[in-house]
C-alpha cells in the first residue's frame, strides 16, 4: 500500500512515515497493516485468504506376501525399488478409487517381513469451513478400504491371483496430520495489536478478517456521514463538518445546523 | 529398460512338441522373475507358468503340469518353455512376461513388462 507524494513537503514527509513505513524516495511505503500518506491510517480487512486446498496424511503400513523381499528393495533408487512403487501405486488407486480426496501414496520405506511398506496415503480437498470433517471422513473411508483389501487379497496355496496380496494382520494406521487452517488465529497475529477489534466473518465460504470499519459485513459499525478510524482503543467515528451543518456523537448521527448556531450566537450579541 | 523378445512359435500336431524361447536385455540384476502367459482367442490372458531366476521358485497351471517344463538360463539370459504333449486347447498367443522383483502372483496386472507374444497352433 503505497501513497505518492509531490511537491517541496516530500522531504519533511520521509521522515514523518509512521508505524514502520519506509520511504523509498517518492512515497512512504507501509507495512501491511497500514496505508494513507503517512502509514498512519490502520486498514480495515487483512488478507488472509485460505490456501486452496488442505491437506491431510495417513502413515499407515502393510505387509505384502506376494513379493519375496531382496536387500535392493531397500534402495530407492533401483530398478527393484521402482518397480515396486509403480506396482504398489497402482494397486493403491484401485483400492482408493472411490474416495475424491485421495491424491496418491508415498512409500517411505521397505522392510523385511514378506515385504513390509511404510507409506503415507495423501489426501486434499478444497478449502471449506467444513474441511476438518470432510478429510475425517475420508481418513475413515482410507481405513475401511485398506482394511477390507488386505482381508480379500490373501495368498492362497503359496500364490497369489490378484495385482498385489497382503498379509491380513499386517495392517496398521500409525498417524493421521491434517494442515491446520484456523482463520481466527490468522486474523489475530495479522491483525497485531489491533487483534481484539478484528474478527472473522464468511462470505460464499470464504473467511474475511476485518474490523468494523469494513463496512458491508454483520460486525460493521455505521458512522453514516463519518469516516470509521481504528486506533488501539478500538473503532471510533471521525465526524464530518459540511457547509451546513456539525456532526457528533458516537456514529456521527446527530447533526446541528450550523445557521442555527450561528443565529443562536448573533442573537446573543 | 528390460526388452522381451519371443521365438518358436508354430503349428504342430496334437501329442506334439515345441520349444519357447524368450531373450532378456535391460536388467540390472541378475535375480528377477520371468513367466509365460498365453491368450487363446476371446479368452482372457492367463499365466502358464513362472519361474525365479535364482532358481528359489517355479509354479506351473495345473493345466500344464506334467507336460510343460520353464527353465531359465543365467548366461544367455534366455527363457524357455518346453512343451509336450500338446493339446488343441493349448492353442494361443504366448507372452513372456518379467518382473525385476521376485513375484509370486499369477495376475498379468503384476507383471510390468510383456514381449510381442508368438502364436502356438494345436491342429491336426
Known amino acids: 500500500r503505497t501513497t505518492t507524494c509531490f511537491g517541496d513537503g516530500c522531504q519533511n514527509t520521509a521522515s514523518r512515515c509512521k508505524n514502520g513505513g519506509t520511504w523509498d524516495g517518492l512515497k512512504c511505503q507501509c507495512p501491511n497493516l497500514y496505508y494513507g500518506e503517512l502509514c498512519e491510517e490502520v486498514v480495515s480487512s487483512i488478507d488472509i485468504g485460505p490456501p486452496e486446498t488442505i491437506s491431510a496424511q495417513m502413515e499407515l503400513t502393510v505387509t505384502v506376501t506376494s513379493v519375496k523381499f531382496t536387500e535392493e528393495l531397500k534402495n530407492h533408487s533401483s530398478q527393484e525399488f521402482q518397480e515396486f512403487k509403480q506396482t504398489f501405486t497402482e494397486q493403491m488407486n484401485i483400492v482408493y478409487s472411490g474416495i475424491p480426496e485421495y491424491v496418491g501414496v508415498n512409500i517411505t520405506k521397505l522392510r523385511l517381513g514378506s515385504v513390509v511398506v511404510e507409506h503415507d496415503v495423501l489426501l486434499r480437498t478444497k478449502y471449506t469451513p467444513e474441511y476438518k470433517t470432510v478429510l475425517d471422513n475420508a481418513t475413515e473411508v482410507v481405513k475401511e478400504k485398506i482394511t477390507k483389501v488386505t482381508t480379500q487379497q490373501i495368498m492362497i496355496n503359496d500364490i497369489c491371483s490378484d495385482m498385489m496380496c497382503f498379509n491380513t494382520t499386517g495392517t496398521q494406521v500409525q498417524n493421521i496430520t491434517v494442515t491446520q487452517y484456523d482463520p481466527e488465529e490468522d486474523c489475530r497475529k495479522m491483525a497485531k495489536e489491533y487483534g481484539d477489534y478484528f474478527v472473522v466473518e464468511y462470505r460464499d465460504q470464504k473467511p474475511y478478517c476485518i474490523s468494523p470499519c469494513e463496512p458491508g459485513f454483520s460486525v460493521s459499525k455505521n458512522c453514516n456521514l463519518g469516516k470509521c478510524q481504528m486506533s488501539l482503543s478500538g473503532p471510533q467515528c471521525l465526524c464530518v463538518t459540511t457547509e451546513t451543518h456539525w456532526y457528533s456523537g458516537e456514529t456521527c448521527n446527530q447533526g446541528t445546523q450550523k445557521s442555527l448556531v450561528y443565529g443562536h450566537h448573533h442573537h446573543h450579541h | 529398460d528390460v526388452q522381451l523378445v519371443e521365438s518358436g512359435g508354430g503349428v504342430v500336431q496334437p501329442g506334439g512338441s515345441l520349444r519357447l524361447s524368450c531373450a532378456a536385455s535391460?536388467?540390472?540384476?541378475?535375480?528377477?522373475?520371468m513367466a509365460w502367459f498365453r491368450q487363446a482367442p476371446g479368452k482372457e490372458r492367463e499365466v502358464v507358468a513362472f519361474?525365479?531366476?535364482?532358481?528359489?521358485?517355479?509354479y506351473y497351471a495345473d493345466s500344464v503340469k506334467g507336460r510343460f517344463t520353464i527353465s531359465h538360463d543365467n548366461a544367455k539370459n534366455t527363457l524357455y518353455l518346453q512343451m509336450n504333449s500338446l493339446r488343441a486347447e493349448d492353442t494361443a498367443v504366448y507372452y513372456c512376461?518379467?518382473?525385476?522383483?521376485?513375484?509370486?502372483?499369477?495376475?498379468?496386472?503384476?507383471?510390468?513388462?510383456w514381449g510381442q507374444g508368438t502364436m502356438v497352433t494345436v491342429s491336426s
Open positions: 535391460g536388467y540390472t540384476s541378475n535375480r528377477y522373475s
Open positions: 512376461a518379467a518382473s525385476s522383483l521376485l513375484l509370486q502372483t499369477i495376475n498379468p496386472r503384476a507383471w510390468p513388462y
Open positions: 519361474i525365479w531366476t535364482d532358481g528359489g521358485r517355479t
